[in-house]
């Protein structure tokens, strides 16, 4: 038998990335009114972090928010994609069909009818695989009919998607090997939908689209990448800085405000009418009356 199995290659999957600031830790941006007079030029030139003035307000690039784009967001939406795909490049040899020149032409009636039969056969072969989506014939060539095709797999994104797709590709290999061993011509008769050459089954390549939330998170956080981490909630990855509340890495600034800087998250402590707050997490309160007497 010459069933050959390949190495796995990976490709990156693009994710639609949007960046959000956390409402609970973000000051409300005052409603902008149309600016008149010389002061406007000053406001325009004060947009920070690559923000641009649109005549009314600063338009902030991803990663920043605030009236002057001075604040760093605490949460970045990194997806994930709803589904992850895999593609297996396979070759099987169909012996129950004669190769004709018409089969080279993908728009011919002959090709369409062959495709219909082949697809129906493969749908039966792979019917027990939940990740199976379908087959796509890439090329037909002489030798009874050598069918180069892709088996398409897809699964819902979970952190274990790679294991799920790896398992599915193994089942595909098992099933195609089995059917091409069992459904063979005997005395010039194919008693099944299609018959195969047992030794003509090859798996050339397996491509799984890769999704790496940690890598995406780091990239999207740019110069703040060292401080953003991925945490999972309901199997969904969240790219957050310690300034985002409600996660295990969240920094508790008590009555202060968490603010991201290039040196990391810092608590900006507040002063009330009665107290000064200090300390790394603004947890040390000093009563003003004790200082002033």
């Amino acid at each position: 038998r010459t069933t050959s199995f390949p190495t796995v290659t990976t490709t990156a999957v693009p994710t639609n990335t949007t960046i959000k600031s956390n409402p609970t830790s973000t000051p409300t941006v005052p409603r902008t009114t149309t600016c008149f007079g010389d002061g406007c030029q000053n406001t325009a030139s004060r947009c920070k972090n690559g923000g641009t003035w649109d005549g009314l307000k600063c338009q902030c690039p991803n990663l920043y928010y605030g009236e002057l784009c001075e604040e760093v967001v605490s949460s970045i939406d990194i997806g994930p994609p709803e589904t992850i795909s895999a593609q297996m490049e396979l070759t099987v040899t169909v012996t129950s069909v004669k190769f004709t020149e018409e089969l080279k032409n993908h728009s011919s009636q002959e090709f369409q009818e062959f495709k219909q039969t082949f697809t129906e056969q493969m749908n039966i072969v792979y019917s027990g695989i939940p990740e199976y989506v379908g087959v796509n014939i890439t090329k037909l060539r002489l030798g009874s009919v050598v069918v180069e095709h892709d088996v398409l797999l897809r699964t819902k994104y979970t952190p274990e998607y790679k294991t799920v797709l790896d398992n599915a590709t193994e089942v595909v290999k098992e099933k195609i090997t089995k059917v091409t061993t069992q459904q063979i011509m005997i005395n010039d008769i194919c008693s099944d939908m299609m018959c195969f050459n047992t030794t003509g089954t090859q798996v050339q390549n397996i491509t799984v689209t890769q999704y790496d939330p940690e890598e995406d998170c780091r990239k999207m956080a740019k110069e703040y990448g060292d401080y953003f981490v991925v945490e999972y909630r309901d199997q969904k990855p969240y790219c957050i800085s310690p300034c985002e509340p409600g996660f295990s890495v969240s920094k508790n600034c008590n009555l202060g405000k968490c603010q991201m800087s290039l040196s990391g998250p810092q608590c900006l402590c507040v002063t009330t009418e009665t107290h000064w707050y200090s300390g790394e997490t603004c947890n040390q309160g000093t009563q003003k009356s004790l200082v002033y007497g």
């Epitope: 004709t100 009636q109 039969t117 082949f118 008769i189 194919c190 008693s191 099944d192 299609m194 018959c195």
Partner: antibody
Amino acid sequence: QVQLQQPGAELVRPGASVKLSCKASGYTFTTYWMNWVKQRPEQGLEWIGRIDPYDSETHYNQKFKDKAILTVDKSSSTAYMQLSSLTSEDSAVYYCARGPYYGTNPWFPYWGQGTLVTVSS
Amino acid sequence: DVQITQSPSYLAASPGETITINCRASKSISKYLAWYQEKPGKTNKLLIYSGSTLQSGIPSRFSGSGSGTDFTLTISSLEPEDFAMYYCQQHHEYPYTFGGGTKLEIK
């Protein structure tokens, strides 16, 4: 949809020959083997043979090897069966029948209406 | 040649009943047996192939079972249109051979 059209009846003299036709429509004629089946009253069905319209490759039931000749005319999408040296034993209904899938499948979802051949002087 | 013995050759039943028709091959034909329905004035209808695979468009009251040498066609809850002639056919080897037929009539 797939259709196999056969003439209703043929009356022939003993010792003569007859050429039965089966005109196919609704599919690509050259991609499916055509089978011929004989049915005599009270005697069930007998498979005579089959032909690949693409290159005229044939397989015969040995019993009919010297009785039937299968041919095709690709231009008119028609299959033919010539029966020779006819006797009363050849009086029967003859069906053409097609397999379900592209290639060589020996079960038949598509049948013609059949041609009744009567051998009589 | 593979001989196919079909039984019974005649069967009377009433609508709503369940009936079985049997075919026995003279040697093993694996799962490769087909069943057909024949009615006057209509083209023959394929019901089952490969022993138990229901042809598309055929009602699920028709079912096939068996492998090797013994096969059964079951029609559950007979409908008036089911009364007809039934044939089995082995599609395992040349020459393809048919059973002698079963005539199913209304009781």
